[in-house]
């Protein structure tokens, strides 16, 4: 799986978890969530070769179609495939609230 | 959705569904397949920015960072959403066999 | 409604010919590969003939190469199996079948049986 115990462990250039750390208030602007501060949302990135964790059926055929016409733009892609939510504090006027905000956190990656 | 109602129709610089034939002799190198020659693929390419077609609450939090820190590299992509079969006719020896290849035609796309 | 409906079925003596049509309805026919399939008692279900479109060329079953020759008309929706010098071992329910080539969409028709016997 491409996810941290193999990804964060190898020097990996093909489709992999990578670390991303958000600031919400530094990184997006919002102000609204008092707690976490930020969280390691990660992120996934990495070029999809033949064959390199393939999603489905036609990211095989399109990374196939790749190697043999390098020239083309068609070419699979290295997006988030298992995600965990987040637990955050708000308030609404003086009363706090928590919630948890699904698909928050990448924890693999697959070639799309 | 990002299908071929809206894609093949307008000139769309984001992310959006891009026709592509794949003749399976000349551009994957495969003899196997007997019929049909080749088919409808498709793929999806182009831009994610913040909010256009978000697949999950990160692939928005990833392209609403990437706005406000646009120097860095993590971004969504650009993937396929819906999928569809590919009918095949192949031989086992002199024996014809007709099979349903899943997930070979991308219908629609999303930014993940 | 999806309809295929097979006819041409029956008892002809061995050597003897029939012609199987099977006229399919409530879906567009010409993104479809038409085929034949046949099931003998006691035996799998087994192509016996197959056409892709638009215009693919004809497959057939080892066994029934050289005798049997499939064809289909799409202005008609209509797909035929011609069986010239038949055996005994062709008796057997024969259906048709439509699967799209692209995409969801497989209808098969209700059968129809064809006993080769003297």
């Known amino acids: 799986a491409l996810d941290a115990a193999y990804c964060f462990r190898n020097v990996q250039d093909n489709c992999c978890l990578r670390p991303l750390y958000i600031d919400f208030k530094r990184d997006l602007g919002w102000k609204w969530i008092h707690e976490p501060k930020g969280y390691n949302a990660n992120f996934c990135a990495g070029a999809c070769p033949y064959l390199w964790s393939s999603d489905t059926q036609h990211s095989r055929v399109l990374s196939l179609y790749n190697t043999i016409n390098p020239e083309a733009s068609a070419s699979p892609c290295c997006v988030s495939q298992d995600l965990e939510p987040l637990t955050i504090l708000y308030y609404i006027g003086k009363t706090p609230k928590i919630e948890q905000l699904s698909n928050m956190i990448v924890k693999s990656c697959k070639c799309s | 959705a990002l299908d071929a109602a809206y894609c093949f129709r307008n000139v769309q610089d984001n992310c959006c569904l891009r026709p592509l034939y794949i003749d399976f002799k000349r551009d994957l190198g495969w003899k196997w397949i007997h019929e049909p020659k080749g088919y409808n693929a498709n793929f999806c390419a182009g831009a994610c920015p913040y909010l256009w077609s978000s697949d999950t609450q990160h692939s928005r939090v990833l392209s609403l960072y990437n706005t406000i820190n646009p120097e860095a590299s993590a971004s969504p992509c650009c993937v396929s959403q819906d999928l569809e079969p590919l009918t095949i006719l192949y031989y086992i020896g002199k024996t014809p066999k007709i099979e349903q290849l899943s997930n070979m035609i991308v219908k629609s796309c999303k930014c993940s | 409604e999806v309809q295929l409906v097979e006819s041409g079925g029956g008892l002809v003596q061995p050597g003897g010919s029939l012609r199987l049509s099977c006229a399919a309805s409530g879906f567009t026919f010409s993104y479809y590969v038409a085929s034949w399939y046949r099931q003998a008692p006691g035996k799998e279900r087994e192509l016996v003939a197959t056409?892709?479109?638009?215009?693919?060329?004809?497959h057939y079953a080892d066994s029934v190469k050289g005798r049997f020759a499939i064809s289909r008309d799409n202005a008609k929706n209509t797909v035929f199996l011609q069986m010239d010098s038949l055996k005994s071992e062709d008796t057997a329910v024969y259906y048709c079948?439509?699967?799209?080539?692209?995409?969801?969409?497989?209808?098969w028709g209700q059968g129809t049986q064809v006993t080769v016997s003297s």
């Open positions: 079948n439509a699967r799209r080539v692209e995409g969801h969409g497989i209808y």
């Open positions: 056409t892709f479109p638009p215009d693919g060329s004809p």
